[in-house]
Interface confidence: low
Amino acid sequence: MAVTACQGLGFVVSLIGIAGIIAATCMDQWSTQDLYNNPVTAVFNYQGLWRSCVRESSGFTECRGYFTLLGLPAMLQAVRALMIVGIVLGAIGLLVSIFALKCIRIGSMEDSAKANMTLTSGIMFIVSGLCAIAGVSVFANMLVTNFWMSTANMYTGMGGMVQTVQTRYTFGAALFVGWVAGGLTLIGGVMMCIACRGLAPEETNYKAVSYHASGHSVAYKPGGFKASTGFGSNTKNKKIYDGGARTEDEVQSYPSKHDYV
C-alpha cells in the first residue's frame, strides 16, 4: 500500500513538475526590466527564451520572436536545449510511469517489469528536473553577470535606434517557476526510485537479505518504504484596451500599457 502511495505521489509530483517546466519554457518573463536600477526608460521590456516583449501604456503587449539562431548568445541556446531535453525526458518518463503504476493492470505484466519501468521513469524525472534546474540557473547566472543582451530590439527586428542606456534586467517569474518545477520533478523522480525498491517481487527482497549483513535487512523488508512528502502545490500577447474615445487604428498605433515598466 505504501509503495503504491509513494509511486502514485511520485507520479503526480513529477506530472506537476513537468507541467511547470513546460510552462516556464514557454513563458516570456525569464528576464524583466530592473526598474529600481534603471528608472530611465518608461517602457517595460521582458524577455523569454523565444521572444522579447514590450509593454506599452494604452493597452497592448508587442512581442517579437528571435528570428535568428546565429545571432543569439550560445548560453541562451544552451538554456533552450536544457529545457527541451528536460521536457522530452519528462514526457517520456511520464509515459513510462503510467504503465509502471501499480494500480494500473496491463495484461500479465510482472511486478519486476513494473519495478524496472518505475526505476527508469524515476531516473528520467531526476534527469529532467536537473536539466530544468540547470537551464534556469544558467540563465539566472547570465543575468547576474550581465551577459544577457539587454536592449529589447537587439534580436527582434523592431527597428529604431538601440538604446545607449544599458537596461538592467532582473529575474523574471519564469525562473522561479522553473526552479520550483525542476525541484518537484526531481523529488517525484526520487520518490519513483524509492517506490521501485518496494515494487520488486517479495522473494527478490528476501534473497537480498541473505546477501547482506543483518543490520541492513530492515531496508529490504517488503513494503518497508513510506512516502510522507507534502508539497503544496503567458505571457499573452493580448489586446488589453478596454474602450475609450479612440478609433481602432489610433489605439493600435498609440503607446500602449506595455511600453512602460
Epitope: S57, G59, M161, Y241, D242, G243, P255, Y260, V261
Partner: antibody
Framework: QVQLQQSGPEVVRPGASVKMSCKGS????????MHWVKQRPGQGLEWIGM????????RLNQIFKDKATLTVDKSSKTAYMQLSSLTSEDSAVYYC????????WGQGTTLTVSS | DVLLTQTPLSLPVSLGDQASISCRSS???????????LEWYLQKPGQSPKLLIY???SRFSGVPDRFSGSGSGTDFTLKITKVEAEDLGVYYC?????????FGSGTKLEIK
Amino acid sequence: QVQLQQSGPEVVRPGASVKMSCKGSGYTLNNFWMHWVKQRPGQGLEWIGMIDTSNGETRLNQIFKDKATLTVDKSSKTAYMQLSSLTSEDSAVYYCAPYGNFADWGQGTTLTVSS
Amino acid sequence: DVLLTQTPLSLPVSLGDQASISCRSSQSIVYGNGNTYLEWYLQKPGQSPKLLIYKVSSRFSGVPDRFSGSGSGTDFTLKITKVEAEDLGVYYCFQGSHVPFTFGSGTKLEIK
C-alpha cells in the same frame, strides 16, 4: 462615453494627508496605466506618476516618491492618490488620466493647503 | 529627466493666421522600438487638457485637420493653420518615452 469622475475639492491643514479618488465609467478599469498630473495655480503641468490598474504596479516621478501613494480598487473602478505631509506647495489641481495618452482626463480635484 | 523647452511662451495671433509652436527636448525621445512618444495638449481656461496630437504627428480623433505635428529626435513643432477663436488656450508638449514623463512649460495662444 468614457468618463472619469474625480472627488470634490479638499481644504486641509499643513502636515495632514489627503486621499483623492478617480472613478471610471464607460470602460473597465483594468489593464492600463492611470496617470496623475499636478497643476499649480497659473502654472504648468507636472507628471506625478502612474499606476498599472491590472496589478497595482506604480511608476513615480522621484520628486513625488515621498509625497504621493497611488492605489487602485478594481471592484469599484476607482484609482486613488494619497498625498502626505502637505504643505502650501501642494496646493494645486490634480488630474487623473488613463491610457497613457491622457485622452480622457478627469475634471481635476482642487487641493488647498491652508492653516 | 528629459527637459522639454517650449517656445514661444506667449504667441499673439490674429484669427485666420497660422501659428507655430516649437518644443525641444534635452535628449532624444526616440524609444528603442523606434517610436517617439511626443504629444501635444490644449488646455482652455477652466478646463482639463485635451489631447491633440500623439506620436509626433498623429491627430487624435475629433481634432480638426488644421492641427498638425512634425519633427524628430529632439525638435518638434505644432502648427495650426487658420487659427480660430476656439483654439485659444495654453498648448503643452509632453514626452512619454522616459520616466519621469515630462511636460513643456506651455505656450499661451492669444488674440493679437
